[in-house]
């Protein structure tokens, strides 16, 4: 199952069903309030907006120049399931699609399934993918966030997300861990780490750190419950922490931000 | 203006080595994966690499894995390729080219000719 | 590895009339995220490949609307509405499911 460092070439995205939940509208996250004052308030802010501007339909990526600062971790909790699944099949959903903590604290991604039959318990597996594109530098490059944001939502796959979409092969796969009954195992690149798998199917960090930025897939695979929609994922990030971040995320809070 | 400009191509004697270059303006090229992608004379398109935006991960075409290796400095906005072990069946025109979404290539280079010969 | 077959492989063509390629792949290009992962690209006389489509049926930025593309799984069409005596060039669909592959390629040129 581990599946650690360069992936094997093929398109392995959302699992089944689309990466965009009908009711898109409503995933959305929160609108953004302006609180700066100055320039540089008004770009970080300019910058905010980009990276969710895109809503939910556009990743995000870590920046190279974030590395040894404190941090803010984001999680964008994507949907990837429809309305309806067909008897005997699992559901899986993300739910919270906004999360803030600060880097070392914890964080937990949540992800629930229902099963239409339950004989026997399914086996929940946590996969890390990097990201296909830089989503932060993007956002701070307006050459870019205009060209290529505009022209995204302009070309008419508002629910296509390139910088979650993209072959294995130009990304890391890894498995994060796994559960069956209450026998958590973690992959091989985190043996160490104190993460494991809570109550339904959350993933749950005690500190977070700067490799952990990228796609975590909740999937939920059953031998009795072969259809319905068996995977769902979240994107995790992690921004430096600049003198612009208040102007960036107002409201933000220092310390962990309960669900 | 975006753009992406290849140099590097030359004649060169089988069995020997050479380097591509790709340097890429207009755009924030730390933000993209990229690709070489080749045509031999007369012929079509062949994909050959492709490396992610951070260079941590990349990918080959099974007739070059092994001698050509791809690579980037985000610094100086430039893509490589490093040819060895060079083969008559390798000669072509190179391009260097810009992933966007769907994993299409949007941006394209004006080429490069490599031909190998003795 | 997906093999891509474009038909045909040469296409004379009269200006302002219609034109179709087709491209068929070895195994489907739909992924589960309702996508299909199929290109399409014009590489003019002397001039570097250019994007026309993506994703199917997106047409790139600056592509005129007389090209589309359709289709799903297997079976794809390039069609040009009107053809332009600027549209002549070799045609070519490329998947992008698994690593990158291109078809033989259409020449289109005019009657």
């Known amino acids: 199952m581990q599946q650690d460092g360069l992936g094997v070439g093929t398109r392995n995205g959302s699992g089944k069903g689309r990466s965009v939940h009908p009711s898109w509208p409503w995933c959305a996250p929160r609108p953004l309030r302006y609180f700066g004052r100055d320039a540089r308030a008004r770009r970080a802010q300019t910058a905010a907006m980009a990276l969710l501007a895109g809503g939910l339909s556009r990743g995000l990526g870590s920046h190279p120049a974030a590395a040894g600062r404190d941090a803010v971790v984001f999680v964008w909790l994507l949907l990837s399931t429809w309305c309806t699944a067909p008897a005997r099949a699992i559901q899986v959903t993300v739910s919270n699609p906004y999360h803030v903590v600060i880097l070392f604290q914890p964080v937990t991604l949540p992800c629930t399934y229902q099963m239409t039959s339950t004989p026997t318990q399914p086996i929940v597996i946590w996969k890390y993918k990097s990201f296909c594109r830089d989503r932060i530098a993007d956002a701070f490059s307006p050459a870019s966030v205009d060209n290529q944001l505009n022209a995204q939502l302009a070309a008419g796959n508002p629910g296509y997300n390139p910088y979650v979409e993209c072959q294995d092969s130009v990304r890391t796969v890894r498995v994060v861990a796994t559960k069956q009954g209450n026998a958590v195992t973690l992959g091989d690149y985190y043996q160490g780490r104190r993460i494991t798998i809570t109550g339904n199917a959350d993933l749950t960090f005690d500190q977070t750190a700067w490799g952990d930025s990228g796609v975590y897939y909740c999937s939920v695979v059953s031998a009795q419950d072969l259809q319905g929609n068996n995977e769902a994922y979240a994107e995790l990030i992690v921004l430096g922490r600049t003198s612009g971040v208040a102007e960036l995320l107002p409201g933000f809070q220092a310390g962990p931000i309960e669900d | 203006q975006v753009q992406l400009v290849e140099s590097g191509g030359g004649l060169v004697k089988p069995g020997r080595s050479l380097r591509l270059s790709c340097a890429a303006s207009?755009?924030?090229?730390?933000?993209?994966?990229m690709h070489w992608v080749r045509q031999a004379p007369g012929k079509g398109l062949e994909w050959v690499a492709v490396?992610?935006?951070?260079?941590?991960?990349?990918h080959y075409a099974d007739s070059v894995k092994g001698r050509f290796t791809i690579s980037r400095d985000n610094s100086k906005n430039t893509l490589y390729l490093q040819m060895n072990s060079l083969r008559a069946e390798d000669t072509a025109v190179y391009y260097c080219a810009r992933d966007s979404p769907g994993n299409a290539f949007d941006i394209w280079g004006q080429g490069t000719m490599v031909t190998v010969s003795s | 590895d997906v093999v891509m077959t474009q038909s045909p492989l040469s296409l004379p063509v009269t200006p302002g009339e219609p034109a179709s390629i087709s491209c068929r792949s070895s195994?489907?290009?739909?992924?589960?995220?309702?996508?299909?992962?199929l290109d399409w690209y014009l590489q003019k006389p002397g001039q570097s490949p250019q994007l026309l489509i993506y994703?199917?049926?997106t047409r790139a930025s600056g592509v005129p609307d007389r090209f589309s593309g359709s289709g799903s799984g297997t079976d794809f069409t390039l069609k040009i509405s009107r053809v332009e005596a600027e549209d002549v060039g070799v045609y070519y669909c490329?998947?992008?499911?698994?690593?990158?592959?291109f078809g033989q390629g259409t020449k289109v040129e005019i009657k």
């Open positions: 207009g755009f924030t090229f730390s933000s993209y994966a």
């Open positions: 195994q489907s290009l739909l992924h589960s995220n309702g996508y299909n992962y």
């Open positions: 994703l199917g049926s």
């Open positions: 490396i992610s935006y951070d260079g941590s991960n990349k």
């Open positions: 490329m998947q992008a499911l698994q690593t990158w592959t």
